[in-house]
């Protein structure tokens, strides 16, 4: 059967003016799964995001991560999309002072 | 085995408006793209838009006014409409399944194509 | 939009030989490429992904290369079957793009 993923979004300072904001995607089984950023709704490209490798974490299930560069302030323009064994989900960016968002997906 | 086929309505005058039904089966629209791309006669593919698992819908900027992509999950069923067709959107049009693990994205399965051509 | 050319539109090849198919890309895509093939009654099929990567299926024979904006498709032993055009793809940036395409015939 399929285990569905933990998804865990961060953010961390860039440089002056722009944050870095990570999915990730952890404890899923199997290991095709898609998570990609969406600004206002609409992918972003290949080019502007960058991804970890979709690797084993040591208990049969799998983690990856995506991460994209953003302008401080518009994080409510960004969400993180993940479809994984025929679900998907919609993840934000937490506000300045939650550095973390949990979801569990059955 | 996953197979996707589109059906049109082959011909379609000018001006009027453009819609093709992409029939899938061996996976689930809840959890997986699906992309149309068109080829007209004699030239190469160009991507004209997708819809993912989510409903959320990705456009070819330089149709996307014209573009509209939709589908029904529980009939398994991806639309695509088009508005005010030209004799230049002549083409073979088909859906095919996206892929996107990653750095990687391709198109994996194929539809045969259906013909559409814009005359009066 | 990123352009996607293929120089050689069309090429003649005999059974056996090894056949090397261009694309050159307006600017670096980073190795988001995908190769597919067309036969002559228009079927579609993923022939490689991501610059070097072979889906199941597809026969050993086929391999691609390339980094930044030049890329290829190689076909080690020409077959039969092999008798199609080829088309390079990008999705570096959106919206993806193709490129004109590579029709390869027997001599």
């Known amino acids: 059967g399929s285990v569905p993923p933990m998804v865990n979004v961060t953010r961390s300072e860039a440089s002056e003016g722009n944050i870095t904001v990570t999915c990730r995607a952890s404890s899923f089984y199997p290991r095709n799964i898609t998570l990609t950023w969406r600004q206002d709704g609409v992918s972003l490209s290949h080019d502007t995001q960058q991804w970890g490798d979709v690797l084993p974490d040591g208990n049969g299930t799998y983690q990856t991560w995506v991460a994209t560069r953003i302008c401080q302030g518009e994080e409510q323009r960004f969400t993180c999309y993940m479809e994984h064994s025929g679900n998907h989900s919609t993840h934000p960016v937490p506000s300045g002072n939650s550095h973390h968002h949990h979801h569990h997906h059955h | 085995q996953v197979q996707l086929k589109e059906s049109g309505p082959g011909l379609v005058a000018p001006s009027q408006s453009l819609s093709i039904t992409c029939t899938v089966s061996?996976?689930?629209?809840?959890?997986?793209?699906v992309n149309w791309v068109r080829q007209p006669p004699g030239k190469g593919l160009e991507w004209l838009g997708m819809i993912w698992g989510d409903g959320s819908t990705d456009y070819n900027s330089a149709l996307k006014s014209r573009l509209s992509i939709s589908k029904d999950n529980s009939r398994s069923q991806v639309f695509l409409k088009m508005n005010s067709l030209q004799t230049d959107d002549t083409a073979r049009y088909y859906c095919?399944?996206?892929?996107?693990?990653?750095?990687?994205?391709?198109?994996?399965?194929w539809g045969a194509g259906t013909t559409v051509t814009v005359s009066s | 939009d990123i352009q996607m050319t293929q120089t050689t539109s069309s090429l003649s090849a005999s059974l056996g030989d090894r056949v090397t198919i261009s694309c050159s890309a307006s600017q670096n895509i980073n190795n988001y490429l995908n190769w597919y093939q067309q036969k002559p009654h228009g079927t579609v099929k993923l022939l490689i992904y991501?610059?070097?990567s072979l889906p199941s299926g597809v026969p050993s024979r086929f391999s691609g290369s390339g980094s930044g904006t030049d890329y290829s498709l190689t076909i080690s032993n020409l077959e039969p079957e092999d008798i199609a055009s080829y088309y390079c793809q990008q999705y570096s940036k959106l919206p993806p793009t193709f490129g004109g395409g590579t029709k390869v015939e027997i001599k």
């Open positions: 061996g996976f689930s629209l809840n959890g997986q793209g």
């Open positions: 095919a399944r996206g892929a996107h693990y990653g750095k990687r994205w391709y198109f994996d399965v």
């Open positions: 991501y610059t070097s």
